[in-house]
């Protein structure tokens, strides 16, 4: 069981510094942005962080959305990595969803974070270049110090 | 919705250029998440895929062809083309031009075909 | 780069019966790219299957996909008249594309 908290909004960028946004197709991509490109980009840029109290605590439960013309959620549903449109629930009533996300900082690494999927015991949300496109997919942890899978979570609020 | 039409000549002479051209309509060409992809299929055999261009120009070959194949792109008229040099029979085949969404890298918009064959 | 391997080559079964379409690649697919194609005689292939598992708009419940690694399936639950044409698996890695070499299915 997962009951919604509180939201904050925030910038995610990869260790390269590269921005996640959403591009006009909905899909999740990294890009290199100065600071400037980021508040110009916005509310493309702009991530609404929900955390979510967790029946079974296992780090912090959250959702990660963004509001352009409409609210969509990230999903992993078969480990492919999509905006949905919806709005994050107020709660969810199982211990595994599509949607939901165990938020950690990375040991020793404070102000790094990983998002593991709570569907699929460990996978990760990760940064990997295919072809020309830095994507958000979603990855098998497959060795310790991964960079791909840590994440700069800067608040905007 | 998105549409795909092939063109070109239908008969070319050993040894020389095939070139087909790929004309989309119902959509840009110039998205992000899109590459744009050749695929032949031989008479009674099965697809391969040939190639594929990104709108900003970069391109990615089958091993196999790639001394023998450019793609290129053409945005303001939402066009991609193939040329495939120095053909033999063995070039002969159907060739079908589509979309490859980068989402899980999948062709999921065809044109309808244009058969080439190779033949003096 | 990797080669996709279809089997068998041909499947004869009957309609209302079960079909499994095997594809297995010579390297590990990752990420789960791998996605299946129907393609009618005269037609353009049809896409079915995406990322191993997801089933493309419009296509009917009675067609999904499974596995990971190196070794996919594409069942078929219960066979349509409609369904006997030629399949075909792809994947992509490293920036490559290919194709499996199909499974004809035909009526028995």
């Known amino acids: 069981y997962f009951g919604k908290l509180e939201s904050k909004l925030s910038v995610i960028r990869n260790l390269n510094d590269q921005v996640l946004f959403i591009d006009q197709g909905n899909r999740p991509l990294f890009e290199d942005m100065t600071d400037s490109d980021c508040r110009d980009n916005a509310p493309r840029t702009i991530f609404i962080i929900s955390m979510y109290k967790d029946s079974q605590p296992r780090g912090m439960a959250v959702t990660i959305s963004v509001k352009c013309e409409k609210i969509s959620t990230l999903s992993c549903e078969n480990k492919i990595i999509s905006f949905k449109e919806m709005n994050p629930p107020d709660n969810i009533k199982d211990t595994k969803s599509d949607i939901i996300f165990f938020q950690r900082s990375v040991p020793g690494h404070d102000n790094k974070m990983q998002f593991e999927s709570s569907s699929y015991e460990g996978y990760f949300l990760a940064c990997e270049k295919e072809r020309d496109l830095f994507k958000l997919i979603l990855k098998k942890e497959d060795e310790l110090g991964d960079r791909s899978i840590m994440f700069t979570v800067q608040n905007e609020d | 919705q998105l549409q795909l039409q092939e063109s070109g000549p239908g008969l070319v002479k050993p040894s020389e250029t095939l070139s087909l051209t790929c004309t989309v309509s119902g959509g840009s060409i110039d998205s992000r998440i899109y590459y744009w992809g050749w695929i032949r299929q031989p008479p009674g055999k099965g697809l391969e895929w040939i190639g594929s261009i990104y709108y900003r120009g970069s391109t990615y070959y089958n091993p196999s062809l790639k001394s023998r194949v450019t793609i290129s792109v053409d945005t303001p008229k939402n066009q991609f083309s193939l040329k495939l040099n120095s053909v033999t029979a063995a070039d002969t085949a159907v060739y079908y031009c589509?979309?490859?969404?980068?989402?899980?890298?999948?062709?999921?918009?065809w044109g309808q075909g244009t058969l080439a064959t190779v033949s003096s | 780069e990797i080669v996709l391997t279809q089997s068998p080559g041909t499947l004869s079964l009957s309609p209302g019966e079960r079909a499994t379409l095997s594809c297995r690649a010579s390297?590990?697919?990752?990420?789960?790219?791998l996605n299946w194609y129907q393609q009618k005689p005269g037609q353009a292939p049809r896409l079915l299957i995406y990322?191993?598992?997801s089933r493309a708009t419009g296509i009917p419940d009675r067609f999904s996909g499974s596995g990971s690694g190196t070794d996919f399936t594409l069942t078929i639950s219960s066979l349509e008249p409609e369904d006997f044409v030629v399949y075909y698996c792809?994947?992509?890695?490293?920036?490559?594309?290919?194709f499996g070499q199909g499974t004809k299915l035909e009526i028995n």
């Open positions: 390297q590990s697919v990752r990420n789960n790219y």
């Open positions: 589509a979309r490859e969404d980068s989402s899980a890298w999948v062709f999921d918009y």
């Open positions: 792809q994947q992509y890695g490293n920036s490559i594309d290919s």
């Open positions: 990322g191993a598992f």
